[in-house]
Amino acid sequence: SSPCPQAWGPPGVQYGQPGRSVKLCCPGVTAGDPVSWFRDGEPKLLQGPDSGLGHELVLAQADSTDEGTYICQTLDGALGGTVTLQLGYPPARPVVSCQAADYENFSCTWSPSQISGLPTRYLTSYRKKTVLGADSQRRSPSTGPWPCPQDPLGAARCVVHGAEFWSQYRINVTEVNPLGASTRLLDVSLQSILRPDPPQGLRVESVPGYPRRLRASWTYPASWPCQPHFLLKFRLQYRPAQHPAWSTVEPAGLEEVITDAVAGLPHAVRVSARDFLDAGTWSTWSPEAWGTPSTGTIPKEIPAWGQLHTQPEVEPQVDSPAPPRPSLQPHPRLLDHRDSVEQVAVLA
């Protein structure tokens, strides 16, 4: 059997660190057998069998010129083996961040904080943390560890499925190369890393007869689980074309009627989502949708002020991307105190 321990990595390759002493091991001999060492393709003897180092070649303060293939020969001239030297560095702790687009799953991504120059792999696992005692604020890793399954195709990402929203987790990402291993531990709670995907299906429509109105509607992101326990709240921004500043409102449901649009101008509208109890952060903005208020054709019958009524929010259908959820509030009223100027203009 070979006297050379096989480091993790391709066979026949041995590893060292620049600036450090490196020992190369002749693989095809018995431990301690004296051998001669040569650089591949060069006749010059690097180290003879009388060195007293047996089957090893010692390179003091290795540098990049020492990288390459070495040949070892036994006393009778037989080939003891070939060894390729590759220089690099031990792993440093990877940089890890985790994110969740819903309240049941989260993913963690990582990057090396320093390139080692050597073959590298990553081991990923997680534990669930629990409180040590009723009167203790300390937390300790308790259950697990479980593997955090990595994406195929080599993407630096692993996903934890079926996480508990109220629990804390400790993520372990270990960078491994032939010179060692280095671990980054990251404590995460789903509540703090929750960031929904942006709302989908944003539509902006004019409201016939009202030249300062636009109705925007949207649906829950498809990635949000279809259960009513965790709702989303929304933030809507709108602005007329060529206008630099956004106006912001927080709609009550999946629809908002803008009542102070600029007549005749196209408006950009976008929406963002967040857990309704303010866990985590707001999503990124949805792609902008555009709409232009109607030109103000008067409805055939304008109801008297006292006869206006609100329409209850329509429950989404079962196959709708939005989950069934309680209606938080009726649709915004078709007219409110901001509309009197517009109404006069329409009636004039």
Epitope: V95, S97, W110, S111, S113, Q114
Partner: antibody, heavy 118, light 107 residues
Framework: EVQLLESGGGLVQPGGSLRLSCAAS????????MTWVRQAPGKGLEWVSS????????QYADSVKGRFTISRDNSKNTLYLQMNSLRAEDTAVYYC???????????WGRGTLVTVSS | DIQMTQSPSSLSASVGDRVTITCQAS??????LNWYQQKPGKAPKLLIY???NLQTGVPSRFSGSGSGTDFTFTISSLQPEDIATYYC?????????FGPGTKVDIK
């Protein structure tokens, strides 16, 4: 020679923007994370932001999050810090530093002074 | 964020004296602690890393010790060129933090 050289500092009004650069030489820039650290006049050191070798992960101090952006161009061996919405409290000498293992800063530049004042 | 405290904030000592600075972290930092020296108008210089390892080229009169949350930096025999401010710094997490510094001068 192994060194870092910052540039781009100067006087800017509150609310203004500035872009700092850090030119690296003498080491394999693309192998290392890089960092910005600042020091207000007469005060201590404050970590500002770091970026991994690939640029794929960045980290910011809460005091600059959303206003500053760290980036790098490995082909030019250069680190950048884009500073927007500057405030008086951002006045400091800004140092570029090379960390080992993300946070052990074994190489520093000389620093560039940023003054935010009206 | 992990808070770092240092004491004393300043000290005066004679040449040849043994000088000790302490640093405390608000939580366990797993020995990911560094010490820097900064002279007026200059960039900081790494002296000690990972609590007790001497950075290459740094004189052996500088040393560090400690673990968990409590750390000590020592100059065994103060020299005139050691007049500077000394900072501890943790890097256990992804947001490194520095102590407020200790200013050392000669009596």
């Amino acid at each position: 020679e192994v060194q870092l050289l910052e540039s781009g500092g100067g006087l800017v009004q509150p609310g203004g923007s500035l872009r700092l650069s850090c030119a690296a030489s003498g080491f394999t820039f693309s192998w290392y994370s890089m960092t910005w650290v600042r020091q207000a006049p007469g005060k201590g050191l404050e970590w500002v932001s770091s970026i991994v070798p690939s640029g794929g992960h960045t980290q910011y101090a809460d005091s600059v999050k959303g206003r500053f952006t760290i980036s790098r161009d490995n082909s030019k061996n250069t680190l950048y810090l884009q500073m927007n919405s500057l405030r008086a409290e951002d006045t400091a000498v800004y140092y570029c530093a090379k960390p080992v293992d993300w946070g052990r800063f074994d190489l520093w530049g000389r620093g560039t002074l940023v003054t935010v004042s009206s | 964020d992990i808070q770092m405290t240092q004491s004393p904030s300043s000290l005066s000592a004679s040449v040849g004296d043994r000088v000790t600075i302490t640093c405390q972290a608000s939580q366990d930092i797993n020995n990911y602690l560094n010490w820097y020296q900064q002279k007026p108008g200059k960039a900081p210089k790494l002296l000690i890393y990972d609590a007790s390892n001497l950075q290459t080229g740094v004189p052996s009169r500088f040393s560090g010790s400690g673990s968990g949350t409590d750390f000590t930096f020592t100059i065994s025999s103060l020299q005139p060129e050691d007049i500077a401010t000394y900072y501890c710094q943790q890097y256990d997490n992804l947001s490194p933090t520095f102590g407020p510094g200790t200013k050392v001068d000669i009596k």
